[in-house]
């Protein structure tokens, strides 16, 4: 697994460097998670032909993966910092159950899957410090999450492979949109 942000040799070798600002830390954390997702996608794509599959829509219908929409205030048109921040945190919290699902889906990248899950938790904590209105954030209901996870794990092998691929792709897109929006804040 890659070294978490702030622990690479360059940081150790340059103690005189200015500490990262909160925005820089968030930016670095997202890029670290995106690197982890790339590694997981590589294993998924090597293992199956899901990455070229045109049958994605079939499986996508069963998943309710978080997506950015115009109303979330994260796009350049109609940008709203607080609305967008609430959407990013809410979306990351909703992704957690899907990241839990990924935990048993990898053989050679098991540690990487865990690193993505744990790093996402750290990112959520960074973002919460930035948010003004935590009351606007609805956390996922554990009972609903449990039945979703059971349903996903009961799928046949092909659908589980497709679900893994779709989760990674959607999470990557969500983080990329978040990164663009956070750079405007």
């Amino acid at each position: 697994a890659p070294v978490p942000p702030g622990e690479d040799s360059k940081d150790v070798a340059a103690p005189h460097r200015q500490p990262l600002t909160s925005s820089e830390r968030i930016d670095k954390q997202i890029r670290y998670i995106l690197d982890g997702i790339s590694a997981l996608r590589k294993e998924t794509c090597n293992k199956s032909n899901m990455c070229e599959s045109s049958k994605e829509a079939l499986a996508e219908n069963n998943l309710n993966l978080p997506k950015m929409a115009e109303k979330d205030g994260c796009f350049q048109s109609g940008f709203n910092e607080e609305t967008c921040l609430v959407k990013i945190i809410t979306g990351l919290l909703e992704f957690e159950v899907y990241l839990e699902y990924l935990q048993n889906r990898f053989e050679s990248s098991e540690e990487q899957a865990r690193a993505v899950q744990m790093s996402t938790k750290v990112l959520i904590q960074f973002l919460q410090k930035k948010a003004k209105n935590l009351d606007a954030i609805t956390t996922p209901d554990p009972t609903t999450n449990a039945s979703l996870l059971t349903k996903l794990q009961a799928q046949n092998q092909w659908l589980q492979d497709m679900t893994t691929h779709l989760i990674l792709r959607s999470f990557k897109e969500f983080l990329q949109s978040s990164l663009r929006a956070l750079r405007q804040m």
Partner: nanobody, 118 residues
Framework: QVQLVESGGGLVQAGGSLRLSCAAS????????MGWFRQPPGKVREFVGR???????NYADSVKGRFTISRDNNNNTVYLQMNRLKPEDTAVYYC????????????WGQGTQVTVSS
């Protein structure tokens, strides 16, 4: 598995306050979510509120603005502060823990009785 024990229930006048505690023992206490539920006499158990691992709280509409959930990680305890109590808040109050994001509420306390008299 985590053992949960509620305390702090009792009889209180309408408009009064109570603070319930939920103490956890067992393996390391860092659950995904801690929830409070209640079961009024002759009715089904209903959701009161929850606090997730990062400290975000959500409440049922019926208690919003009156009840507050907090936690003390050092003491492995979650609290439910209940203000401006109403007779319809009379119920057995339960706390529950979800150990992981996909586990559902997998540990429950035995409950504590709260009675609000008019």
């Amino acid at each position: 598995q985590v053992q949960l024990v509620e305390s702090g229930g009792g009889l209180v006048q309408a408009g009064g306050s109570l603070r319930l505690s939920c103490a956890a023992s067992g393996r390391t206490f860092s659950p995904y979510t801690m929830g409070w539920f209640r079961q009024p006499p002759g009715k089904v158990r209903e959701f009161v509120g929850r606090i997730n691992w990062s400290g975000i709280r959500n409440y049922a509409d019926s208690v919003k603005g009156r009840f507050t959930i907090s936690r003390d990680n050092n003491n492995n305890t979650v609290y439910l502060q209940m203000n401006r109590l109403k007779p319809e808040d009379t119920a057995v109050y339960y706390c529950a823990a979800a150990s992981r994001s996909g586990s559902g509420y997998d540990s429950w306390g035995q409950g504590t009785q709260v009675t609000v008299s008019s």
